[in-house]
């Protein structure tokens, strides 16, 4: 560690006195200290002396001395008061920036350690500090106010008691800054915009920090915006603003608008687009695929969405048939919107019995006119199943009635004993048929079909089955015959709750 | 060896704020004073003004009403901020170590900043 | 504040030759506080001299400094090709501190 002479903490002169101090280390070695005038610089190897023959108050400090070449980076220093009865401090400094909740020196240094007793801190023009400033003071250094605030942002005068009177400091400005989080919050409303050619269109873009120093500025497809600025002040936080008011708009407004916010932690930028139209429109459309299948007893939600502008003035389900006259009951039918110019309907269809088959369509207005878009809405139903016996054209015929949607399928068995259903170990025969007869095949309705299995002789000890099945299940008919006519039979009793 | 870096964006609007920042390594931003400078294109080394490490500043005088320097002794750091700029702002800005005796013996290797709409 | 005046504004010289700079300060500057620069095209300054006459770390023994008051001089005793740049001359004792205009020192 560099030693220095004279070896004494702090050293009293009166200005005009000479100074020398000097200092020794193993290595070369350097003095800091404050910005002072009419020093001379000495260096010769491993000393180095600083020296004046006309101290002024202006030399009050602490000088130190350190050693570059040491690994530790050791230091000495000795502090400096020149006692000018006229100059009762030696301020470094105009300005002193802080970030809140810092320390802030303020450095006036004390030129004669004796006037200690008697120092305050004051702001300029003789006003007091502001309640709840919490200062110290050290004369080698300053005052220091403790966990400055950004209200103490004001210019400060020290003062020190001389002979009766205060004199002052020249005044040091205080600078508090706000520690920013990041760059400025953003906002740009709307979000999105549509004008029809000829009306008038309002963007706003504001940006808000903690600290006054950022900027903002909105601009339309990369070209910076004019825009006289609004300043406030409210919550604890600057507010700048920035409104673009068109009073007709035309098709060179449209495009993309961006507002920017920076400052030292950043830049932020949210965008909107602006659409200029001919005229008014209403779109309607669905994710749905317009035609929809459903189980009977299931459930079902109809979505549409639409885009207008201007805003919808009606809109409305409606049941179109063909089964009933019932209209969709309002409290099934459900909007949201998904923003200024988009939404979305829902119309849910719980629990769907036989007669709420069929279209259903949903309408809007807007200035633009009506739309409508369709659904159709057809139900699903597992076959039901009949067999009789009868003569066709002389001929002894079982004829399978199956009614179901989508169209069922038809399955004749033959199998021994008697039974209400066929099993694999029974079968003797199996008829596929490929194309039954279509009886009837109405929109929303089942599909009713008939197959005919011409038998020459009813075996008696045996089982006729027609089994029938589609995409949502299968039904069967098991037709026994006995000795004083045919016996036919149903499978268990098919319960249905719609 | 003591390093100076600055950095900040090269282009500037006018009208609008300068920031740059001047990270230091190599030695204790608590120790020295630090100064910021600039050079416009062809011409001289213009002093902007110094900071000691607990936040006492110095400044040009014929800068002083737009400047802010500020010190960040966790990161080590120190900035500048030099607001309302105009095309007469465009120079390359150094950062150096200013010390009493010795003059400014580290320098950054400098940042061009271009003030233009 | 205190200006400083270089002289001459360009010197055009041959490699090997001696070099004689002068700064000129429109008041006292005491020597501790003057200091010379040298810069590079495309590089930041480098501090040659400090207190009028001190060499910095690393600078060769052919540059020397001298002076006080009202006028200084940097003086490169046999220029090396590496020794054309600009050059300034710096006060650093009092607020604001102070550059002079530059001198060129070129190749002839």
């Known amino acids: 560690i560099p030693v220095i002479e004279p070896s004494v903490p702090e050293l009293v002169v009166k200005p005009g006195a000479t100074v020398t101090l000097r200092c020794v280390g193993n290595g070369s070695v350097e003095w800091d200290g404050p910005p002072s005038p009419h020093w001379t610089l000495y260096s010769d190897g491993s000393s180095s002396i600083l020296s004046t023959n006309n101290a002024t108050f202006q030399n009050t400090g602490t000088y130190r001395c350190t050693e570059p070449g040491d690994p530790l980076g050791g230091s000495a220093a000795i502090h400096l008061y020149v006692k000018d009865p006229a100059r009762p401090w030696n301020v470094l400094a105009q300005e002193v920036v802080v970030f809140e909740d810092q320390d802030a020196l303020l450095p006036c240094l004390l030129t004669d350690p004796v006037l200690e007793a008697g120092v305050s801190l004051v702001r300029v023009r003789g006003r007091p500090l502001m309640r709840h400033t919490n200062y110290s003071f050290s004369p080698w250094h300053g005052f220091t106010i403790h966990r400055a605030k950004f209200i103490q942002s004001q210019d400060y005068q020290c003062s020190a008691l001389m002979g009766g009177r205060k004199v002052m400091s020249i005044s040091i400005r205080l600078k508090v800054q706000k520690v920013i989080p990041g760059p400025p919050a953003l906002t740009l409303v709307p979000a999105e915009l549509v004008r029809i050619r000829g009306e008038a269109a309002q963007i706003v873009c504001s940006a808000s920090s903690v600290d006054v120093n950022f900027d903002v500025f909105l601009q339309h497809n990369n070209t910076k915006l004019a825009i006289p600025q609004q300043s406030d002040f409210h919550n604890n936080r600057y507010q700048k603003v920035l409104t673009l008011n068109l009073d007709q708009v035309d098709f060179q407004h449209a495009g993309n608008y961006s507002c920017v916010a920076s400052n030292v932690q950043g830049k932020h930028s949210t965008s909107m687009f602006f659409r200029v139209v001919e005229s008014a429109y209403l779109n309607l459309s669905s994710e749905q695929n317009l035609i929809q299948e459903v189980t009977v007893g299931e459930g079902l939600n109809l979505k549409v969405m639409v885009e207008a502008y201007p805003g919808l003035q009606g809109f409305n389900w409606t049941y179109l048939g063909p089964f009933s006259d019932h209209q969709p009951e309002p409290k099934l039918a459900n909007a949201t919107t998904k923003d200024t110019y988009r939404h979305t309907f829902t119309l849910s269809l719980p629990r769907l019995k036989p007669s709420e088959a069929g279209r259903y369509s949903f309408l809007a207005r807007n200035p633009g006119g009506w739309r409508a878009l369709t659904f159709e809405l057809t139900l699903r139903y597992p076959p039901e199943v009949s067999v009789i016996w009868t003569f066709i054209n002389g001929s002894g015929t079982l004829l399978c009635a199956a009614s179901g949607y989508p169209q069922p399928n038809v399955t004749w068995l033959q199998c021994s004993g008697h039974t209400d259903r066929c099993d694999e170990a029974q079968v003797l025969q199996v008829w596929d048929d490929p194309y039954p007869e279509v009886l009837s095949q109405e929109p929303f309705h089942k599909v009713t079909v008939q197959s005919l299995l011409t038998v020459e002789t009813l075996e008696h000890n045996q089982t006729y089955e027609c089994r029938a099945h589609n995409s949502v299940g299968s039904g069967s008919w098991a037709f026994i015959p006995i000795s004083a006519g045919a016996h036919t039979h149903p499978p268990d009793e098919f319960l249905f709750t719609p | 060896q003591v390093q100076l870096q600055e950095s900040g964006p090269g282009l500037v609007k006018p009208s609008e704020t300068l920031s740059l920042t001047c990270t230091v390594s190599?030695?204790?931003?608590?120790?020295?004073?630090w100064s910021w400078l600039r050079q416009p294109p062809g011409k001289g080394l213009e002093w902007i003004g110094y900071?000691?490490?607990?936040?006492?500043?110095n400044y040009n005088p014929s800068l002083k009403s737009r400047v802010t320097i500020s010190v960040d002794t966790s990161k080590n750091q120190f900035s500048l901020e030099l607001s309302s700029v105009t095309a007469a702002d465009t120079a390359v800005y150094y950062c150096?170590?200013?010390?009493?005796?010795?003059?400014?013996?580290?320098w950054g290797q400098g940042t061009t900043v271009t003030v233009s709409s | 504040e205190i200006v400083l005046t270089q002289s001459p504004g360009t010197l055009s010289l041959p490699p090997g030759e001696r070099a004689t700079l002068s700064c000129r300060a429109s008041?006292?500057?005491?020597?501790?506080?003057l200091a010379w620069y040298h810069q590079k095209p495309g590089q930041a300054p480098r501090l040659l001299i400090y207190?009028?006459?001190s060499r910095a770390t690393g600078i060769p023994d052919r540059f020397s400094g001298s002076g006080s008051g009202t006028d200084f001089t940097l003086t490169i005793s046999r220029l090396e090709p590496e020794d054309f740049a600009v050059y300034y001359c710096?006060?650093?004792?009092?607020?604001?501190?102070?550059f002079g205009q530059g001198t060129k020192v070129e190749i002839k």
């Open positions: 150096a170590r200013d010390r009493t005796f010795y003059g400014m013996d580290v």
């Open positions: 190599g030695a204790s931003i608590s120790t020295y004073f």
């Open positions: 900071i000691f490490y607990s936040g006492s500043i």
């Open positions: 008041q006292n500057v005491s020597s501790t506080y």
């Open positions: 207190g009028a006459s």
């Open positions: 710096q006060q650093y004792g009092s607020s604001p501190r102070t």
